[in-house]
């Protein structure tokens, strides 16, 4: 990664794992203070590729609850409300960082973990494979 | 939250902020080993609400690079390639965790931060406000 100039006011670390084990303050700073909470809440229902949200809960993880999107249909919803199977509803996935308690049940020791979550669905034109 | 049963093998913490300041191992464990990374890579182009990905880089953040989706059109793309402005392309947003160096430039001290990122776009029916 980028070499960060060391600040003389930094916490010291003589840890043999330095800098792979770091101190993290869990008092979360939220950068979304200006966000309108009504903004994207009902897209799951109004989308042409609507989805439901399913709970994935794990007390050994931070955050402990993650919501996974599952597309309601294989196809996409047309203006008349019927499903068009010539198009496909597909999940949009994102890799996110979570903290995993390690060792298990330890309240103050974690390991970073990457997990893939489905955030919502989008309607795509299918890839048609032509047989020669 | 729920009191996690303390494991006797846990690292000790006499920090006055305990348990809000924790140790985190940055050797990331990746749970997505079976995922095909190319699987959803072309949805941005094939979607009826296509998007472009813009790089957001910040050396004081971990991960330092985040990709933000921006919808290409206000409307949605029809089968003939034209844009239907009776429908709306909207970003699907996800709240994610990142680590922010705190104090700045410190290599081994971070604060958790929640940020809202746009992951992709979906096509929605607009909300029509009827004037009385």
């Amino acid at each position: 990664g980028i070499a960060i100039p060391r600040n003389s006011g930094c916490p010291n670390s003589e840890d043999k794992n330095f800098p792979r084990t770091v101190m993290v303050n869990l008092n979360i700073h939220n950068r979304n203070t200006s966000t309108n909470p009504k903004r994207s809440s009902d897209y799951y229902n109004r989308s042409t590729s609507p989805w439901n949200l399913h709970r994935n809960e794990d007390p050994e993880r931070y955050p402990s609850v993650i919501w996974e999107a599952k597309c309601r249909h294989l196809g996409c919803v047309k203006a008349d409300g019927n499903v068009d199977y010539h198009m496909n509803s597909v999940p949009i996935q994102q890799e996110i960082l979570v903290l995993r308690r390690e060792p298990r049940h330890c309240p103050n020791s974690f390991r970073l973990e990457k997990i893939l979550v489905s955030v919502g669905c989008t309607c795509v034109t299918p890839i048609v494979h032509h047989v020669a | 939250g729920i009191a996690i049963p303390r494991n006797s093998g846990c690292p000790n913490s006499e920090d006055k902020n305990f348990p809000r300041t924790v140790m985190v191992n940055l050797n990331i464990h990746n749970r997505n080993t079976s995922t095909n990374p190319k699987r959803s890579s072309d949805y941005y182009n094939r979607s009826t609400s296509p998007w472009n990905l813009h790089r957001n880089e910040d050396p004081e953040r971990y991960p330092s690079v985040i990709w933000e989706a921006k919808c290409r059109h206000l409307g949605c793309v029809k089968a003939d390639g034209n844009v239907d402005y009776h429908m709306n392309s909207v970003p699907i947003q996800q709240e994610i965790l990142v680590l922010r160096r705190e104090p700045r430039h410190c290599p081994n001290s971070f604060r958790l931060e929640k940020i809202l990122v746009s992951v992709g776009c979906t096509c929605v029916t607009p909300i029509v406000h009827h004037v009385a």
């Epitope: 979360i28 939220n30 979304n32 809440s41 949200l53 399913h54 709970r55 | 729920i2 929640k114």
Partner: antibody
Framework: EVQLVESGGGLVQPGGSLRLSCAAS????????MLWVRQAPGKGLEWVAI????????YYPDSVKGRFTISRDNAKNSLYLQMNSLRAEDTAVYYC???????????????WGQGTLVTVSS | DIQMTQSPSSLSASVGDRVTITCRAS??????LSWFQQKPGKAPKSLIY???RLVDGVPSRFSGSGSGQDYSLTISSLQPEDFATYYC??????????FGQGTKLEIK
Amino acid sequence: EVQLVESGGGLVQPGGSLRLSCAASGFTFSDYTMLWVRQAPGKGLEWVAIIKSGGSYSYYPDSVKGRFTISRDNAKNSLYLQMNSLRAEDTAVYYCARDGDYGSSYGAMDYWGQGTLVTVSS
Amino acid sequence: DIQMTQSPSSLSASVGDRVTITCRASQDINSYLSWFQQKPGKAPKSLIYRANRLVDGVPSRFSGSGSGQDYSLTISSLQPEDFATYYCLQYDAFPPYTFGQGTKLEIK
């Protein structure tokens, strides 16, 4: 000890507005999703609004969509429900409840407030 | 939306009896099911979560079981303070969370 205390209920005329508040203590409020659930006299339980920990996402059932707005102030450990265009069928005891998000919980709605009564009548 | 069908709607029993209340979901809810107890004029109180996990402080005579679509709450030996209304809640799929219609447990 986790505590949730609602306030702001009362008698209001149809078409009127009311703002409910819920003061939270005993847990890291900003780590939890919060909900409002209501119970009409002699009836069952119905959720009316939910807001994620950071406040960036909120959801409503069709019965209140466009009339009710949930919000939160994490600095004040407070949850709110702004209710506009009230109808007789909104008469109920309104409870605030907690759900897991960053912090873990005993499932959804593990802790509830004592409730505040909203009566919509002319 | 997932529908929750709770039965029976009312039940008469005596102190010391073993009683079982059931909830059926319209689809698999992956054991994301809670049970609540509500007494008149009071807020609901959480008893069981994740289908079979007892909330701290809840007496061990309460137990939950089930998976997939079918779940039950059992009180092994009824005590006078157990007469109340019981609700199940699915919290797997959202929105919305859905409650059962309630079971009123009365003294015979």
